[in-house]
Interface confidence: medium
Amino acid sequence: EVEKTACPSGKKAREIDESLIFYKKWELEACVDAALLATQMDRVNAIPFTYEQLDVLKHKLDELYPQGYPESVIQHLGYLFLKMSPEDIRKWNVTSLETLKALLEVNKGHEMSPQVATLIDRFVKGRGQLDKDTLDTLTAFYPGYLCSLSPEELSSVPPSSIWAVRPQDLDTCDPRQLDVLYPKARLAFQNMNGSEYFVKIQSFLGGAPTEDLKALSQQNVSMDLATFMKLRTDAVLPLTVAEVQKLLGPHVEGLKAEERHRPVRDWILRQRQDDLDTLGLGLQGGIPNGYLVLDLSMQEALS
């Protein structure tokens, strides 16, 4: 903490301007009025203060607003935001998307810091749900944002917000997250026609159940292998050889290269070898020809 010292004669700041960069830390503390700083925060960002000087300015704001800064100040924090701790940010009440954008801009190009994560958490909780505009903003700054949320947090995403999601936003999502997002996407895109629907839903298919994959296989969608490999194993297992052939279309040949990988290897084990042979791909490891498989066991395998 900077010691309280009297402001030297003639140095009392009347404006937040560039002359302040020549002030020593103790002079800033003594000569800059906190209320003046708060009303002219928008000017701070344009002045090349040192990190040490920014520490003093933060300290002045902390003294003025011990319960947390008002949004009028938060919106203009600029690089001073980088000085904030998650504890500081938890005291804030940020409701404006413009404020959120302004602060995310400061951190642009960097990994999501604990400060940013706390800010986003405060903002989303304040809004009650992850609406489309917020999701648009967050994924623009952090493409992996959606996949950083827990399945519980994702459940608050309304289907209408799914329109803001781009394929790359889902790259790091795990199956549990896609399980939550897929039904929302299905609802969001339900009025689209076949080919347009598939283009939109494709990124979410890692959460699709068997019956939806069966339905897609009847629509000549020609799913690529990369998408197929991301499908839920338990959703792929009940598909017949014919259904997989229809689902993949010309991409079915790619199964050979993936025969050792999940979910293909699990699916192969559950198919009759003579059915696999009809694909002409040389896939091996299916149920031996002539081997009797009881329906009871197969039902359990699919349950």
Partner: antibody, heavy 119, light 107 residues
């Protein structure tokens, strides 16, 4: 709860065939939810997966051992077996049978049986 | 074949320490990564499956994280019974492969 128990000779001569059986109790080898694997661990070394069998008879073997390995299942006895032919001293190891669930993890293991290849 | 590389191969720690073991796959394996604990003369015991899911009956002091190629097993506060060898294993692609193991010893 489900338990696995390996059985078979502890000493096998070089060039002969190693034969082990794993008996499943408290559950069924015919369950469609599991793969039944064999895994081995040479003394003081790490774990090596040998292969697995599905109740339907479908198998998947480690390519490094494929030419010498046969895994079979006997649903009537609730057992699955391992045969490893043309053994050498390098096959000396503790052999484990294990159950792999849908999540891809070996959640239940036998206690292991030491097999020494020596003349 | 997918190679699994564990580090460190051994470490010394004290009761109460936080311990982190890493496992790297030679190619992406999504979340198909499991962790096991093995004590001398015993079969391995499953701790974590699907990279981060705690196996039933395993103490909550064990946790797993990671996706793609890089994974971590963390023991938040080492207990006397946790001194053992730990293995990672990928189940994405056959042949199923294990890491070389990390031996956790008493300092």
């Amino acid at each position: 709860q489900v338990q696995l128990q390996e059985s078979g000779p502890g000493l096998v001569k070089p060039s002969e065939t190693l034969s082990l059986t794993c008996t499943v109790s408290g559950g069924s080898v015919s369950s469609g939810s599991y793969y039944w694997s064999w895994i081995r661990q040479p003394p003081g070394k790490g774990l090596e997966w040998i292969g697995y069998i599905y109740y339907s008879g479908s198998t998947n073997y480690n390519p490094s051992l494929k030419s010498r390995v046969t895994i079979s299942v006997d649903t009537s006895k609730n057992q699955f077996s391992l045969k490893l032919s043309s053994v050498t001293a390098a096959d000396t190891a503790v052999y484990y049978c294990a159950r792999e669930g849908k999540n891809g993890a070996f959640d239940i293991w036998g206690q292991g049986t030491m097999v020494t290849v020596s003349s | 074949d997918i190679q699994m590389t564990q580090s460190p191969s051994s470490l010394s720690a004290s009761v109460g320490d936080r311990v982190t073991i890493t496992c790297r796959a030679s190619q992406s394996i999504s979340s198909y990564l499991n962790w096991y604990q093995q004590k001398p003369g015993k079969a391995p015991k499953l701790l974590i499956y699907a990279a981060s899911s705690l196996q039933s009956g395993v103490p909550s002091g064990f946790s797993g994280s990671g996706s793609g190629t890089d994974f971590t097993l963390t023991i938040s506060s080492l207990q006397p019974e946790d001194f053992a060898t730990y293995y990672c294993q990928q189940s994405y692609s056959t042949p199923l492969t294990f890491g070389g193991g990390t031996k956790v010893e008493i300092k």
